[in-house]
Amino acid sequence: SYQVICRDEKTQMIYQQHQSWLRPVLRSNRVEYCWCNSGRAQCHSVPVKSCSEPRCFNGGTCQQALYFSDFVCQCPEGFAGKCCEIDTRATCYEDQGISYRGTWSTAESGAECTNWNSSALAQKPYSGRRPDAIRLGLGNHNYCRNPDRDSKPWCYVFKAGKYSSEFCSTPACSEGNSDCYFGNGSAYRGTHSLTESGASCLPWNSMILIGKVYTAQNPSAQALGLGKHNYCRNPDGDAKPWCHVLKNRRLTWEYCDVPSCSTCGLRQYSQPQFRIKGGLFADIASHPWQAAIFAKHRRSPGERFLCGGILISSCWILSAAHCFQERFPPHHLTVILGRTYRVVPGEEEQKFEVEKYIVHKEFDDDTYDNDIALLQLKSDSSRCAQESSVVRTVCLPPADLQLPDWTECELSGYGKHEALSPFYSERLKEAHVRLYPSSRCTSQHLLNRTVTDNMLCAGDTRSGGPQANLHDACQGDSGGPLVCLNDGRMTLVGIISWGLGCGQKDVPGVYTKVTNYLDWIRDNMRP
């Protein structure tokens, strides 16, 4: 039966009709009492006092209501949940993930996990209603957990009309014997010992390091991974693993050449709630590789939205060459990652200036052949974008990737809803399209426009009358991603390039074929 529920937008927790709860007010000491009434949360401030017994984990501050028994935890940065039991910074799981308390909420199939408190799970062996729920990491959230000592974190998903368990796509911290690091690498315990410049690391117990803080003599050396070796480590929470080196007889330090373990193409997808002409409104967490490129124009003040882009590594964005025909100076460009609303700053967004950009030298501005460009983000270190739930790289395809004709893929962007609209979308949109066979991606299918082997076609194949809302890219989406699921990860197949109108029946959009440019991309991203 259909149930009215409330979703607390601040915490993403769900509540039944007439259920009440307390919530802390961000950046203040106030606490609000909320009540779920006809699907809407009604909240007002209530007086609170310190809790009589500790109830919050991870250093959370406990406050209880003055006139009734509920309590609320003010969590320190990096923690969330009713009892601050959720580690929002956990990027991967250790061993089987029994102790995993991160925020990954996507199953291997790409489906969104169901909230453990959902009444639909009441009869399941594991739900947030269990008396030992907190100990098992279950509660009013939909994050992947492993409460039954299975092989890895899992969750319940709704498919084929019922709720069933499915393993999650949460990254594992140690992928076999692959020597790479997750996050900032503070947990890295591998054996790389060369810096980015090729210099050899000094042993952490070297006499030369006397007087330095991070050495094998540090009281916390063992916990920090320092010892009688010269392996790269990150004992101080820096951007990535590093080590001490001697350069020209001078003691200094350098970042290491340890590769970061790829979390590319993994995302926490949430089902779009709103249809819109040409697609569906989406959250940036569903497309964390989506970039928004803005440009300052010589003739007009301020910045204006230029094109989409795609994050393919910490410091590199892929886009379409035709976006840069005005030959903007790099310092006139800005790239924004992690933004859901096109011109409204996001809470977790990351903003970058552009160091340089490279347009394919054989780009043809008549036919849009070789419609590809690379932008290097400006940064003080070798890292630019910091991985988060809203900022993550897409996977580049293997050179031999051949997806079957009519594979369903998706694109995203801040472009117009329809060709004749004067405005770009105010919010990120996604569209679901299918890959056309090459026999249907020819000049004769596209009003005799030139179609080259460097292009591919994709479009909405649903039938429908003149009022059908067919999904497609549109003006302003250019430079953005066309991604398809491959080996459990979203993989970049095309760059939004051109089309005839938007969302017309039997007229596909045209995309730059990324597999043709893998060597070009790698060549231009060289240090």
Partner: antibody, heavy 114, light 112 residues
Framework: QVQLVQSGAEVKKPGASVKVSCKAS??????INWVRQATGQGLEWMGR????????GYAQKFQGRVTMTRNTSISTAYMELSSLRSEDTAVYYC?????????WGQGTLVTVSS | DVVMTQSPLSLPVTPGEPASISCRSS???????????LDWYLQKPGQSPQLLIY???NRASGVPDRFSGSGSGTDFTLKISRVEAEDVGVYYC?????????FGGGTKVEIK
């Protein structure tokens, strides 16, 4: 430290093919390049492969005759040269490229003789 | 293809004395990403080549500071401030900016 270990010497007849392997340890995410050197001659670049995605770039001179592949599960790159002729007799090196070809294999001598 | 021309072909040296090798490219070897991928390699007798200098002037790990590289555009130089007996072998310049990547013909350095 990256280490590259190549397969052993080969003797082939003209018109045949040869496949040389190069096993990498350490950071295996760098390009693998293939360079050859005929006896008493200089170095000649043949092409490169990205061990991750498998994308390749070949010198025009070898296009159509050379195929570079990789097996990521065993961190090994391969260079196959077909339609061999006597002038292909050389030592074939693999070299790992990050900012330059900093690490080289020990070389594999391929002799083409009837 | 970019042709890399090295001179001299042969360089007899006295230990302790300086030495210099020149390398000229047939066109600019500035890559489209702004970097100049001009490297120097040394191949000692019976060994695989080894990297000395990368991107014109950067010394590779473990390379003695008597080796230095310089140049821009199409003209590049490798200098050895004081030659040692272990420096003998064939020195190659190399451009990795334009495909096909190409090596110079080599300069043989030998002790007088």
């Amino acid at each position: 430290q990256v280490q590259l270990v190549q397969s052993g010497a080969e003797v082939k007849k003209p018109g045949a093919s040869v496949k040389v392997s190069c096993k990498a340890s350490g950071n295996t995410s760098y390009w693998i390049n293939w360079v050859r050197q005929a006896t008493g001659q200089g170095l000649e670049w043949m092409g490169r492969i990205d061990p991750g995605g498998g994308s390749t770039g070949y010198a025009q001179k070898f296009q159509g005759r050379v195929t570079m592949t990789r097996n990521t599960s065993i961190s090994t790159a391969y260079m196959e040269l077909s339609s061999l002729r006597s002038e292909d007799t050389a030592v074939y090196y693999c070299a790992s490229y990050y900012y330059a070809m900093a690490y080289w294999g020990q070389g594999t001598l391929v002799t083409v003789s009837s | 293809d970019v042709v890399m021309t090295q001179s001299p072909l042969s360089l007899p040296v006295t230990p302790g004395e300086p030495a210099s090798i020149s390398c000229r490219s047939s066109q600019s070897i500035v890559h489209s990403n702004g970097n100049t991928y001009l490297d120097w390699y040394l191949q000692k007798p019976g060994q695989s080549p080894q990297l000395l200098i990368y991107k014109v002037s950067n010394r590779a790990s473990g390379v003695p500071d008597r080796f230095s590289g310089s140049g821009s555009g199409t003209d590049f130089t490798l200098k050895i401030s004081r030659v040692e007996a272990e420096d003998v072998g064939v020195y190659y310049c190399f451009q990795g900016s334009h495909v096909p990547w190409t090596f110079g013909g080599g300069t043989k350095v030998e002790i007088k």
